[in-house]
């Protein structure tokens, strides 16, 4: 009986034409929905002219249903058992399940201003650039609605640049009508162990963002795991959101609409600066801001978005170092909220329910050449928005998964 | 097509007054920024003064400041330079030159400027 | 100030010679340097900027190279028309600051 169903499961989660698991994998049939926080800013002028603490109150959630496009030029390829493919973007906003509208106004860094000040840290450059954000009357902070901080604005500023240069600036831009990829993940049919491990992404088996380990692509995409999870295993899998290979460990079992699922979770020994976790050595890549490589909880992704400081971290600065949070006021992180977790059914490897959260932070530094950066006497690296990637298995499909899966089993 | 083309040099005597000017075409001088830069006779260059883009701040070499003055007249898409109490070593040809991230992509013919008694 | 020192000062050369010019910032300039080439009687002409970007039309023999504080311009086979003046320039710090030139001479 098990091995029967060992080789039918075997032969289900394949990825390729006719299998269960190739239908689900090509669209999902899960809802993904991606809630977004936004971090408003309540004291702007306090914190530019006196270098106060930012005092941040987050409105949300602004929700938009995500995924919901198949993949892309999905190419088989026999020799090496590969399956190639974009995974397009597309983002919808679902007003019902949003507290407002994406013309709300949100108070904001900066995010043009922020980003020049840290590529052109030379002083004649943060001369001109002075002069450009004067004459724009742009400052530290900015009024943005949510449309235009997640997907796009044409920013005053860099429009005064005598240069082709790009002038649109969204921390999601540009994101509708673009895709993510090419992803060439095996298939399986050789090594079902091996089963939507991602061999290349874009072309290389490695990101060019890190040194050593920390630069590898691992795992799959976490949309699923090669059958038969086991509790003991580290689960590892890639997040282009974050640049990086990113592990979980098991917590808990989990009864899911009928379906015994193991909760992995994303550890705060993930995020530990190399002095708790030697293994987070590379993921350190200056000393200024890092202290040293102590700070722990924000990863900079900067080499990733062209330059920008960006860092990425768990909502409200959830298992980051306290000099990290110290300069912003109002934050509370808790683990149930604001941590990440997949919920696996072991047989099959699927992910049927997940919680993805992340937060998108900018750094802005004191500058003595910029005005409106002159009085500032620290470094901050200021939250933006957080978000809550959700998608749980539907009614009908675990039905499905429970007579034709689990309940064979059981 | 971008030019600059320079005016206004000529024979000073020590202490004496001057006013460049250079009158640009092809692109907007305040997108930019101008520069002005010498060359004193069989020496190498010395940048001299510079006004920042959108009328936005000056500066100056030490061994001018005080003396010489950078402006700009947008609506005729023409910079100045106003070299007061003028020394020998003043002796120069005097570019403008185009910049806008601190490298010059286009420069003037260039306008002597002589000064002795 | 940022002094830029080029070397050397003056070089004799043939035509279709490699001719290598190094220039040394006082303090880190990243990339920030620029060169030029400067003819008797003439305004300079932009080469490279960014200490490795060829400036458009300027032909593909002229190369920059170098970080921080050490820059090199090379001419890898030199024509008639480059016997001239050549001049780097660091446009990182203000005052911009240029080498004392290196002038380049008929063998």
């Known amino acids: 009986g098990d091995l029967l169903i060992q080789k039918t499961i075997k032969k289900q989660v394949v990825l390729e034409e006719g299998t269960i698991a190739f239908k689900n994998w090509v669209k999902t049939g899960t809802e993904v929905y991606r809630q977004f926080w936004i971090f408003d800013v309540q004291n702007p002028q306090e914190v530019m002219m006196n270098s106060s603490n930012i005092q941040v109150k987050q409105r949300g959630p602004y929700t938009y249903r995500v995924r919901f496009l198949a993949k892309e030029n999905v190419t088989q390829d026999a020799e090496d058992n590969t399956v190639s493919f974009l995974q397009p973007n597309g983002a919808i906003f679902e007003p019902s399940l949003s507290v407002g509208t994406e013309a709300d106004n949100f108070t904001v860094l900066n995010l043009a201003v922020a980003a020049a000040s840290h590529i052109y840290q030379n002083q004649f450059v943060q001369m001109i650039l002075n002069s450009l954000i004067n004459k724009s009357k742009s400052s530290m902070f900015q009024v943005r609605t949510l449309r235009e901080l997640l997907w796009g604005y044409r920013d005053p500023f860099l429009s005064l640049v005598p240069y082709p240069v790009t002038t649109t600036v969204g921390l999601f831009y540009p994101y509708n009508n673009t895709a993510d990829g090419v992803y060439k993940v095996f298939n399986g049919k050789d090594n079902i162990s091996k089963v939507a491990i991602i061999d290349t992404y874009k072309g290389k088996r490695n990101l060019s963002y890190w040194e050593s380990h920390c630069d590898m692509i691992n795992g799959t995409d976490a949309a699923s795991f090669p059958p038969f999870v086991e509790k003991s295993q580290v689960l590892q899998f890639f997040s282009s959101d974050i640049c990086r290979s990113i592990y979980a460990v098991f917590e808990s079992d989990v009864n899911l609409k009928g379906i015994p699922v193991y909760r992995f979770v994303l550890p705060s020994k993930a995020f530990a600066s190399p002095v708790e976790n030697p293994d987070n050595y590379c993921f350190c890549t200056e000393k200024i801001i890092s202290k040293n490589c102590t700070s722990y909880g924000v990863l900079d992704i900067s080499k990733c978005k062209e330059g920008r400081p960006v860092y990425i971290s768990l909502p409200h600065f959830l298992y980051a170092s306290p000099d990290v949070s110290e300069p912003i006021d109002g934050l509370n992180p808790n683990e149930e909220e604001h941590r990440t977790y997949l919920d696996i059914e072991p047989i099959t490897g699927f992910t049927l329910q997940f919680a993805k959260r992340l937060q998108v932070n900018l750094l802005v530094k004191p500058s003595e050449k910029i005005q409106v950066l002159k009085n500032l006497k620290r470094n901050y690296i200021v939250p933006i928005l957080w978000l809550n990637e959700t998608g749980t298995i539907g009614d009908e499909k675990a039905n499905m998964f429970r007579s034709q899966v689990t309940g064979k089993i059981n | 097509e971008v030019q600059l083309v320079e005016s206004g040099g000529g024979l000073v005597q020590p202490g004496g007054s001057l006013r460049l000017s250079c009158a640009a075409s092809g692109f907007t001088i305040s997108s930019f920024g101008i520069h002005w830069v010498r060359q004193a006779p069989g020496k190498g260059l010395e940048w001299v003064a510079w006004i920042a883009p959108y009328g936005g701040d000056t500066y100056y070499a030490d061994s001018v400041k005080g003396r010489f003055t950078i402006s700009a007249d947008t609506s005729k898409n023409t910079a100045y330079l106003q070299m007061n109490s003028l020394r020998a070593e003043d002796t120069a040809v005097y570019y403008c030159?185009?910049?806008?991230?601190?490298?010059?992509?286009?420069w003037g013919q260039g306008t002597l400027v002589t000064v002795s008694s | 100030d940022i002094q830029m020192t080029q070397s050397p000062s003056s070089l004799s050369a043939s035509v279709g010679d490699r001719v290598t010019i190094t220039c040394r910032a006082s303090?880190?300039?990243?990339?920030?340097v620029a060169w030029y080439q400067q003819k008797p009687g003439k305004a300079p002409k932009l080469l490279i900027s960014y200490a490795t970007s060829l400036y458009s039309g300027v032909p593909s023999r002229f190369s920059g190279s170098g970080s921080g504080t050490d820059f090199t311009l090379t001419i890898s086979s030199l024509q008639p028309e480059d016997f001239a003046t050549y001049y780097c320039?660091?446009?990182?710090?203000?005052?911009?600051?240029f080498g004392q030139g290196t002038k380049v001479e008929i063998k």
């Open positions: 303090q880190d300039v990243s990339n920030w």
């Open positions: 030159a185009r910049s806008f991230f601190g490298y010059f992509d286009y």
């Open positions: 320039q660091q446009h990182s710090n203000a005052p911009l600051t």
